[in-house]
C-alpha cells in the first residue's frame, strides 16, 4: 500500500531561539577569537618591523627585548616574516567567513522572528517589549573641557568616521560636521559632544516645520533641515554604527519644560532586515535587567509603504503618522505628526508624537532628539 | 608657522575675471573647511563663500552666486576664487579664513585669517 | 538673512576705562554669535567665539555674554593696543552675517 508518510514536527519557539542564540554566540565567539588573534598577530609584525635595520645588524634601536649586542639571522627574521604573513592571510580569510557567517545568522534569527509573528506564536507581553523602562537622566551630560583639536588632527588625514572619531582627536564643540563611514559617501551630520564623548543626532523635531509622515524611501534616504527639524536617514546611520551595538539616547521634552532622558543600548540591522532596532544588554552603570526587553527581540522600521510591524491586523505607521520601529502601535512613536495644541479627537490624537511610558498615550511631545554613539567594536552582537 | 597667503589680486574691468589663491601651511589643511570674507574699501566685513574639506558642501552669498566658483586642492594646501562677471561693487581686499573647527561645515567662527589680496 | 546691528558705531576711550559695545541680532541665534578684532591695515583676528568662550591667546581683559538675540563684548580695562575696530558675526544660518562693526580709539 502507500508509503504513510509522518506529518512533520515544527520546532517548537523555544528551540528555534536556543538554536538561533547558540548559532549567533558562535558566530560571535569565532568572531572574537579571530579578531584577537588577528591583533595579536598585527601586534607582532608592527615590533618586527619596527625592529627593522636593527634586527638586521644596522644601526638603530629596538624594542624586542635583545641583548644589546645580540643580532637576529636575516634568514630568519624573512621567515619569521613570510609565515607570519600565511598565518595572517588565513585569519583573515577565517575573519571574513565569520562575519560572512554572522550576517548569515543574523538574517535567519530575523526570519525566524517574522515567521513566528505571523503564526501568532508570540506571547503578546513580548510584543511590547518596549515598554521595558530604560535609565533615566535628566540630561546628556554637559560639554566636556575644549581640548585643542590642531594637537591631534594629524592623526587624521581622512574624514571622520563618525562623531566620537571627531571627539577622539580633540573636538569639543558641538555642531554641524562633515563625516564618512568606511564605504560610505561623505555627509553632514550634527554632533552633540559630551563628556561621554561625541554623540550623533539622528532626529531632530521641535517646531513641526518638517512633514515626517513619508515613504520608506525617504527614511532610507534622509529628509529636513540639519539647522532644524530633520531624520538623518536609516542608511547613514547604519553605516555610521555597522555592525557595532550601540547607544541610543532619546531626548524628551513636554510643553511644561519637562525634560527626560533615556538610554539604550541597541543594535541596528541594515536593509536587509528592515533596520531592525534590537535592545541589547543594560547600558553599564544603569539600571540593569529592566532595559533588556524579553529574547532581545528585534523591531524592524515601518513606515506607510513598507508595512514590518509586528502586527498582522494593522498597519501601524498608516493608522498612526509617520515612519518607526513599530512593536504594536502604543508604545512610542518620535516621528508623528507634531501638535502645537492637544486636539479634541482621539483618533487624531494618537497621530502625535508620543512615548507611552513618559508622559502617556495621549501627550503630543513639544520636543523630540534622538542620538546615537557606537560603542567600541569588541561590543558588537 | 601656521598662516595662510592670499594672491591673485589686480585691476580688471567690470565683467572681466580674477582668480584667488590661497597658499596654507603648518595645519592639516585637508582637516578644514575654508572661507573666503570680503571687505570694500572702507566698509565691513561680508562672507562669500564656504567649502568643506572634502568639497563636498559648498555655499555662496546670494551677491555672488553665479558668478563665483569656490574650489580647493588638498594636495595643494590650496584654496581658490574663481571670480567671473566681474562688478564694480565687487572691489575690495579678500581675505582667506580658516573655519574653527576641524571638519566643520557651516555653523563655525573663522579662527585662522590671511593678510588679503 | 540675519542682520546684525552694533552698538555705539564708535567710542573713544580712555586707557583703563571699560568698554561695553553691543550686538543685536534680527532673530534668535542662540549662542552663534563670535567677536573679531581688526586693526588698521590688519586682517581681523577671532577674540570670542560663541558667546562667552576666549578664545586661546586672547588677552583675559576681553570677555562676552550674552544669548539668543542680545550679545555683548567687554573690556576690562583698556589698553592702548586695543585701538581697533570690533565686529561680531552670526554662524547660526546662511549666509554668515557680520555686524557693521564699532571703533574704539584711545583719547
Known amino acids: 500500500g502507500p508509503v504513510q508518510s509522518k506529518s512533520p514536527r515544527f520546532a517548537s519557539w523555544d528551540e528555534m531561539n536556543v538554536l538561533a542564540h547558540g548559532l549567533l554566540q558562535l558566530g560571535q565567539g569565532l568572531r572574537e577569537h579571530a579578531e584577537r588573534t588577528r591583533s595579536q598577530l598585527s601586534a607582532l609584525e608592527r615590533r618586527l618591523s619596527a625592529c627593522g635595520s636593527a634586527c638586521q645588524g644596522t644601526e638603530g634601536s629596538t624594542d624586542l627585548p635583545l641583548a644589546p649586542e645580540s643580532r637576529v639571522d636575516p634568514e630568519v627574521l624573512h621567515s619569521l616574516q613570510t609565515q607570519l604573513k600565511a598565518q595572517n592571510s588565513r585569519i583573515q580569510q577565517l575573519f571574513h567567513k565569520v562575519a560572512q557567517q554572522q550576517r548569515h545568522l543574523e538574517k535567519q534569527h530575523l526570519r525566524i522572528q517574522h515567521l513566528q509573528s505571523q503564526f501568532g506564536l508570540l506571547d503578546h507581553k513580548h510584543l511590547d517589549h518596549e515598554v521595558a523602562k530604560p535609565a533615566r537622566r535628566k540630561r546628556l551630560p554637559e560639554m566636556a573641557q575644549p581640548v585643542d583639536p590642531a594637537h591631534n588632527v594629524s592623526r587624521l588625514h581622512r574624514l571622520p568616521r563618525d562623531c566620537q572619531e571627531l571627539f577622539q582627536v580633540g573636538e569639543r564643540q558641538s555642531g554641524l560636521f562633515e563625516i564618512q563611514p568606511q564605504g560610505s559617501p561623505p555627509f553632514l551630520v550634527n554632533c552633540k559632544m559630551t563628556s561621554d564623548g561625541g554623540w550623533t543626532v539622528i532626529q531632530r523635531r521641535h517646531d513641526g516645520s518638517v512633514d515626517f509622515n513619508r515613504p520608506w524611501e525617504a527614511y532610507k534616504a534622509g529628509f529636513g533641515d540639519p539647522h532644524g527639524e530633520f531624520w538623518l536617514g536609516l542608511e547613514k546611520v547604519h553605516s555610521i554604527t555597522g555592525d557595532r551595538n550601540s547607544r541610543l539616547a532619546v531626548q524628551l521634552r513636554d510643553w511644561d519644560g519637562n525634560a527626560e532622558l533615556l538610554q539604550f543600548s541597541v543594535h541596528l540591522g541594515g536593509e536587509d532586515t528592515a533596520y531592525s532596532l534590537q535592545l541589547t544588554a543594560p547600558v553599564a552603570g544603569q539600571l540593569g535587567a529592566t532595559t533588556v526587553p524579553p529574547s532581545g527581540l528585534s523591531v524592524p522600521f515601518s513606515t506607510w509603504d513598507q508595512d514590518h510591524d509586528l502586527r498582522r491586523d494593522k498597519n501601524c505607521a498608516k493608522s498612526l503618522s509617520g515612519g518607526w520601529w513599530f512593536g504594536t502601535c502604543s508604545h512610542s512613536n518620535l516621528n508623528g505628526q507634531y501638535f502645537r495644541s492637544i486636539p479634541q479627537q482621539r483618533q487624531k490624537l494618537k497621530k502625535g508624537i508620543f512615548w507611552k511610558t513618559w508622559r502617556g498615550r495621549y501627550y503630543p511631545l513639544q520636543a523630540t532628539t534622538m542620538l546615537i554613539q557606537p560603542m567600541a567594536a569588541e561590543a558588537a552582537s | 608657522e601656521v598662516q595662510l597667503v592670499e594672491s591673485g589680486g589686480g585691476l580688471v574691468k567690470p565683467g572681466g575675471s580674477l582668480r584667488l589663491s590661497c597658499a596654507a601651511s603648518g595645519f592639516t589643511f585637508s582637516s578644514y573647511s575654508m572661507n573666503w570674507v570680503r571687505q570694500a574699501p572702507g566698509k565691513g566685513l561680508e562672507w562669500v563663500s564656504s567649502i568643506s574639506s572634502s568639497s563636498t558642501y559648498i555655499y555662496y552669498a546670494d551677491s555672488v552666486k553665479g558668478r563665483f566658483t569656490i574650489s580647493r586642492d588638498n594636495a595643494k594646501n590650496s584654496l581658490y576664487l574663481q571670480m567671473n562677471s566681474l562688478r564694480a561693487e565687487d572691489t575690495a581686499v579678500y581675505y582667506c579664513?580658516?573655519?574653527?573647527?576641524?571638519?566643520?561645515?557651516?555653523?563655525?567662527?573663522?579662527?585662522?585669517w590671511g593678510r588679503g589680496t | 538673512e540675519i542682520v546684525l546691528t552694533q552698538s555705539p558705531d564708535f567710542q573713544s576711550v580712555t586707557p583703563k576705562e571699560k568698554v561695553t559695545i553691543t550686538c543685536r541680532a534680527s532673530?534668535?541665534?542662540?549662542?552663534?554669535l563670535h567677536w573679531y578684532q581688526q586693526k588698521p591695515d590688519q586682517s581681523p583676528k577671532l577674540l570670542i567665539k560663541y558667546a562667552s568662550q576666549s578664545f586661546s591667546g586672547v588677552p583675559s581683559r576681553f570677555s562676552g555674554s550674552g544669548s539668543g538675540t542680545d550679545f555683548t563684548l567687554t573690556i576690562n580695562s583698556l589698553e592702548a593696543e586695543d585701538a581697533a575696530t570690533y565686529y561680531c558675526?552670526?554662524?547660526?544660518?546662511?549666509?554668515?552675517?557680520f555686524g557693521p562693526g564699532t571703533k574704539v580709539d584711545i583719547k
Open positions: 532673530q534668535s541665534i542662540g549662542s552663534s
Open positions: 558675526h552670526q554662524s547660526s544660518n546662511l549666509p554668515h552675517t
Open positions: 579664513a580658516r573655519d574653527g573647527a576641524i571638519f566643520g561645515v557651516v555653523n563655525w567662527y573663522f579662527d585662522l
